[in-house]
């Protein structure tokens, strides 16, 4: 029975050319994360594996640096960049947990936080 | 549980528009998730087609890009292909699903076998 | 696109034996592959994901390892019902694609 709860840094906002760190944690459940993926709907960013690291897609790797953690630390942010990121968890022997951030890349300084979110 | 079921015509002539439907059960297409069309000529592999989201944003295979529209009617839960300008080589069984967050599919429908021929 | 190529294309084999089918990437997709089984008339149905994580309800027979480019789906003891055409797809980039099959037969 899957426990956990996925808690995010929510729907985020940064300034174009700037970075952001994008940043999941896995609470309420004592399953082991053996792996954990980065990824954009239609593309893969990076992975996190317990036994053979960090994986940068070829795609992402001049902007966007592992950590901290097993978040994802995204550089040199263009308007392109906003939209929706997933941390997927894989873990032991709960399955597979999610969780969703929302980025918006501002033109302006007017970026700022956004509240946390739980997704179950 | 969510369901998938394909619809539409089993035969298309040659040049004109392949339109399939998949109607979802189970769960709003506008809720989450990407929605898939993928296709199986007979007797060979899976190709993917392409996806909508369920915001609304569209990516397609380059391949078929310039032949190929998805689009969504919320009010029917339901999502469509279209295929312009066919030919025998599109003859295939086309195949709804539902896309994980990380790019596998766990929920299919049942596919539906389009021949393309005059 | 990256290609994905399976062997053998078709096996034979007999209730109880162990069977392991290959797929190999044409680029580095890490551990981003997916296997499905496929009987005929039906759709895929999704059997391990990451390489190495099975999907629900998968029995624990079926097992999948690799990374990098070489990827391996085991079955350790072959059951009536597994005789099926078994694909791999890589989950690593759009367009995403499928290997072109590997059939396993009854001996």
């Known amino acids: 029975m899957m426990t956990g709860t996925i808690e995010t840094t929510g729907n985020i906002s940064a300034e174009k050319g700037g970075s952001i760190i994008l940043q999941c944690h896995l609470s309420s459940t004592t399953a082991q994360v053996t792996q954990v993926n980065w990824e954009q709907q239609d593309q893969l960013l990076a992975i996190c594996n317990a036994d053979l690291g960090w994986h940068i897609s070829p795609s992402f790797k001049d902007r966007v640096a592992p950590g901290p953690g097993l978040g994802l630390t995204l550089q040199s942010l263009t308007v392109n960049d906003t939209g929706e990121y997933f941390c997927i968890y894989h873990t032991y022997p709960d399955g597979t947990y999610t969780g969703r951030i929302f980025l918006e890349v501002l033109e302006s300084s007017v970026a700022e936080h956004g509240a946390r979110f739980q997704i179950p | 549980q969510v369901q998938l079921q394909e619809s539409g015509p089993g035969l298309v002539k040659p040049s004109q528009t392949l339109s399939l439907t998949c109607t979802v059960s189970?769960?709003?297409?506008?809720?989450?998730?990407?929605w898939n069309w993928i296709r199986q000529p007979p007797g060979k592999g899976l190709e993917w087609i392409g996806y909508i989201s369920y915001s609304g944003n569209t990516r397609y295979n380059p391949s078929l890009k310039s032949r190929v529209t998805i689009s969504v009617d919320t009010s029917k839960n339901q999502f469509s292909l279209k295929l312009s300008s066919v030919t025998a080589a599109d003859t295939a069984v086309y195949y709804c699903?539902?896309?994980?967050?990380?790019?596998?599919?766990?929920?299919w429908g049942q596919g539906t076998l389009v021949t393309v021929s005059s | 696109d990256i290609q994905m190529t399976q062997s053998p294309s078709s096996l034979s084999a007999s209730v109880g034996d162990r069977v392991t089918i290959t797929c190999k990437a044409s680029q580095d997709v890490f551990t981003a592959v997916a296997w499905y089984q496929q009987k005929p008339g039906k759709a895929p149905k999704l059997l391990i994901y990451?390489?190495?994580y099975r999907y629900t309800g998968v029995p624990s027979r079926f097992s999948g390892s690799g990374s990098g480019t070489d990827f391996t789906l085991t079955i350790s003891s072959l059951q009536p019902e597994d005789f099926a055409t078994y694909y791999c797809q890589q989950h690593y980039s759009t367009p995403w694609t499928f290997g072109q099959g590997t059939r396993l037969e009854i001996k």
């Open positions: 699903a539902r896309k994980y967050y990380g790019s596998w599919f766990p929920y």
């Open positions: 990451s390489a190495s």
């Open positions: 189970g769960y709003s297409i506008t809720s989450d998730y990407a």
